[in-house]
């Protein structure tokens, strides 16, 4: 999915009112330091294709993320926001609930939550200039 | 645990320049923008601009534009801030601030630099 | 720029009691706001972040409320260590902008 036609202020908005709480809630008992960010991006909509790639798709580890209220309320933004993005999830949907796992919070989806909170961290500032 | 130690006081002549540093420590430099506020009595806190330290990228206030500039050195984790052609109104207190771990607000201030200028 | 107006400079409370510190926005600043102590001679200290959220270490009789544009800081249980300046900054666009500033004290 382009992310280029989301309403990236709304995301935003719903990011620092509502995500932001749960992945506070999920990283509760975790240090800020304790991981360092592997992943990055460039601009917002690059960021929100990370952002989906590290929520939603299931890594060695961690395969439970999608279930969590962070994730349900990321793809209610993505599906409001971003025209068209609920139509090219049905499938990814479907696919989810055929491999659906208990709930197991490891120090592998700490750490992957710890990804997300520097992409939506950098997706949140308003746009840089380089120097 | 999160440190952001800054420069000491400065004294300097008007239309001198200065640069002003802040270390951190205890985290990622380069996964935390960096802000510089400015303080005084008559305008309070007042918001200088910031810096990614990643990619080198700003944003200043329209105040503070071709007064202040940002850099930040990814080998020494260290921020500074350069301020030109200084006269008493850039007398103040200057902080360092940490973005914050889930953006949309700062957390760790520095401990400040004190700048007077005068002749 | 969005202009946060801290109408109250001066605000004058006892230990024990509850006082609320207010912060109005020019506009829409939506929930990224934040409070921000400053005792006498020191830095600030982050309080509270996003509008309602505690920042690590800070005592639970601080509480923050509010989204849009009408934000507020509950000190319940006044400690005559809270006499200090308090200031509101929004997060919402480039530049930042603090609040005036209100300083609190003990009667």
């Known amino acids: 999915y382009d992310f280029t036609n989301c309403d990236f202020e709304k995301i935003k908005a719903a990011y620092l009112s509502t995500i932001s709480k749960d992945l506070i809630t999920y990283m509760s008992g975790t240090k800020s330091t304790e991981f360092n960010n592997t992943v990055s991006c460039s601009n917002r909509p690059h960021c929100l294709t990370e952002i989906q790639s590290l929520t939603f798709n299931p890594t060695a580890g961690c395969a439970s993320l999608a279930k969590e209220m962070f994730a349900m309320k990321t793809k209610a933004a993505l599906a409001i926001w971003c025209p068209g993005y609920s139509e090219t999830q049905i499938n990814a949907t479907q696919a989810m609930k055929k491999r659906r796992k208990r709930k197991v919070t490891t120090n592998k989806c700490l750490e992957q939550v710890s990804q997300l909170q520097g992409l939506w961290r950098r997706f949140n500032r308003p746009l840089l200039k380089q120097q | 645990q999160v440190q952001l130690q800054q420069s000491g006081a400065e004294l300097v002549r008007p239309g001198a320049s200065v640069k002003l540093s802040c270390k951190a420590s205890g985290y990622m430099f380069t996964d935390y923008a960096m802000h510089w506020v400015k303080q005084t009595p008559v305008h309070g806190l007042e918001w200088i601009g910031t810096i990614d330290p990643e990619t080198g990228g700003t944003a200043y206030t329209q105040k503070f534009k071709g007064k202040a500039t940002l850099t930040a050195d990814i080998s020494s984790n260290t921020a500074y801030v350069e301020l030109r052609s200084l006269t008493s109104e850039d007398s103040a207190v200057y902080y360092c601030?940490?973005?914050?771990?889930?953006?949309?607000?700062?957390?760790?201030w520095g401990q400040g630099t004190t700048l007077s200028v005068s002749s | 720029d969005i202009v946060m107006t801290q109408s109250q400079k001066f605000m004058s409370t006892s230990v024990g009691d509850r006082v609320s510190i207010t912060c109005k926005a020019s506009?829409?600043?939506?929930?990224?706001v934040a409070w921000y102590q400053q005792k006498p001679g020191q830095s600030p200290k982050t309080l509270i972040f996003?509008?309602?959220n505690r920042h690590t270490g800070v005592p639970d009789r601080f509480t923050g409320s509010g989204s849009g544009t009408d934000f507020t800081l509950t000190i319940s249980n006044v400690q005559s260590e809270d006499l200090a300046d308090y200031f509101c900054l929004q997060l919402w666009n480039y530049p930042y902008t603090f609040g005036g500033g209100t300083k609190l004290e003990i009667k």
């Open positions: 601030t940490r973005e914050g771990s889930y953006g949309g607000y700062v957390d760790y």
């Open positions: 506009q829409n600043v939506h929930t990224a």
């Open positions: 996003l509008a309602s």
